[in-house]
């Protein structure tokens, strides 16, 4: 089930998925002056079997001005360039996402892609938050959000993160580690089924994350 909304916005913070659950879609968007090739894919889709997941379809952009020039690139994961991903840039892979069953790693860039990616997340997806450069984090709980299905509707849990404007030499002085709870806030709706998956594996992964995995340069 696709999540009906985007993850919550936290002032002066950005979010990133460390791995994308099967069923996640990424729109093939091109930057200004470029368009998808004729009859080109509308999106990439994270799909596969129990042993391996990968992105199906390929995004390709071509100049709006020319008819026949097709611009595309499919670099290897280790050759990935920096670019904006949803709201956060991803200069490197923090964990071996290929080892996460049922998940895809960050899709490699395609030439002339738009500066902001439009992802369609699925239930059970977790995203992680980090304060932007110049702001420090005050944690009251996990700096993460999970898309959950509750009473037949999807919603994102609220990340327990406040970013304050105090300049610090180190980005996260005295930062406590994210707690292993996938739930950002206490729930009042305890009487109904909550459909979520792989919290444990993702929170274990979150616990091993270093703060340095997030770039602090933004467009």
């Amino acid at each position: 089930e696709l999540c009906d909304d985007d993850p919550p916005e936290i002032p002066h913070a950005t979010f990133k998925a460390m791995a994308y659950k099967e069923g996640t879609m990424l729109n093939c968007e091109c930057k200004r002056g470029f368009r998808r090739i004729k009859s080109g894919s509308l999106y990439m889709l994270c799909t596969g079997n129990s042993s391996h997941s990968s992105w199906d379809n390929q995004c390709q952009c071509t100049s709006s001005a020319t008819r026949n020039t097709t611009k595309q690139v499919t670099p290897q994961p280790e050759e990935q360039k920096e670019r904006k991903t949803t709201e956060m840039q991803s200069p490197m892979q923090p964990v071996d996402q290929a080892s996460l069953p049922g998940h895809c790693r960050e899709p490699p860039p395609w030439e002339n892609e738009a500066t902001e990616r439009i992802y369609h997340f699925v239930v059970g997806q977790m995203v992680y938050y980090q304060c932007v450069q110049g702001y420090r984090a005050l944690h009251r709980g996990p700096a993460e959000s999970v898309c959950k299905m509750t009473h037949g509707k999807t919603r994102w849990t609220q990340p327990q993160l406040i970013c304050t404007g105090e300049m610090e030499t180190s980005q996260f002085p005295g930062e406590e580690k994210p707690q292993a709870s996938p739930e950002g806030r206490p729930e009042s709706e305890t009487s109904c089924l909550v459909t979520t998956t792989d919290f444990q594996i993702q929170t274990e992964m979150a616990a091993t994350m270093e703060t340095s995995i997030f770039t602090t340069e933004y467009q």
């Epitope: 696709l2 009906d4 909304d5 069923g23 879609m25 729109n27 968007e29 009859s39 894919s41 509308l42 999106y43 889709l45 799909t47 596969g48 199906d56 379809n57 390929q58 439009i118 369609h120």
Partner: antibody
Framework: QVQLVQSGAEVKKPGASVKVSCKAS????????MHWVRQPPGQRLEWMGA????????SYSQKFEGRVTITADTSASTAYMELSSLRSEDTAVYYC??????????WGQGTTVTVSS | IVSTQSPDTQSVTPKEKVTITCRAS?????MQWYQQKPDQSPKRWIY???KSASGVPSRFSGSGSGTDYTLTINSLEAEDAATYYC???????FGQGTKLEIK
């Protein structure tokens, strides 16, 4: 539950235009691609184009480009497909369909368009 | 990109095993199949080549890779009489359809 309800049958003269609507309910309209597929009598399904209502991004089949326009009214959760310069070969059942990623998971009931002089 | 199905029409008896093939003009990673009955909208049937959509009976299966794909019905039932279309997600092209008739 998800529903796609299309407008009623149309009879048009050659050279005219037709605009078919598809009213979506039961899901977040702006977050799914909506496609238009047609089926002439006794023939295969034929993809015409799609729209992403979240930003009005569209994609058209080369066969119909220039003749088809797909739009969406997010306030009414309705997608539209307009086909111009109609000819007899455009007589078909026109379907709207929601793209779930893996497949088109929900389809409208179909709108019969007859082009006849 | 074109998808060619065979056969166009197949008359079969209940409990028979049925195989429908779809050949794509270019190699693609996955194939989808839709079922359509007369005067009805198509229904998603098989996706990602071999995964059954919810509600699809277990007698249906899909397989294939590259350019050649197959939809198999292990033991045909009367309710399976329909037209089956293969579909390439990346190019949105449909095969011409295979109509299954019950003898």
């Amino acid at each position: 539950q998800v529903q796609l309800v299309q407008s009623g049958a149309e009879v048009k003269k050659p050279g005219a235009s037709v605009k078919v609507s598809c009213k979506a309910s039961g899901y977040s309209f702006t977050r799914y691609w909506m496609h238009w597929v047609r089926q002439p009598p006794g023939q295969r399904l034929e993809w015409m184009g799609a729209i992403y209502p979240g930003n009005s991004d569209t994609s058209y089949s080369q066969k119909f480009e220039g003749r088809v326009t797909i739009t969406a009214d997010t306030s009414a959760s309705t997608a539209y497909m307009e086909l111009s310069s109609l000819r007899s070969e455009d007589t078909a059942v026109y379907y709207c369909s929601r793209d779930y990623g893996y497949y088109f998971d929900f389809w409208g009931q179909g709108t019969t368009v007859t082009v006849s002089s | 990109i074109v998808s060619t199905q065979s056969p166009d029409t197949q008359s079969v008896t209940p409990k028979e095993k049925v195989t429908i093939t779809c050949r794509a003009s270019s190699s693609r990673s996955y194939m989808q199949w839709y079922q359509q009955k007369p005067d009805q909208s198509p229904k998603r049937w098989i996706y990602d080549t071999s995964k059954s959509a919810s509600g699809v009976p277990s007698r249906f299966s899909g397989s294939g890779s590259g350019t050649d794909y197959t939809l198999t019905i292990n033991s045909l039932e009367a309710e399976d009489a329909a037209t089956y279309y293969c579909h390439q997600r990346s190019s949105y092209t449909f095969g011409q359809g295979t109509k299954l008739e019950i003898k």
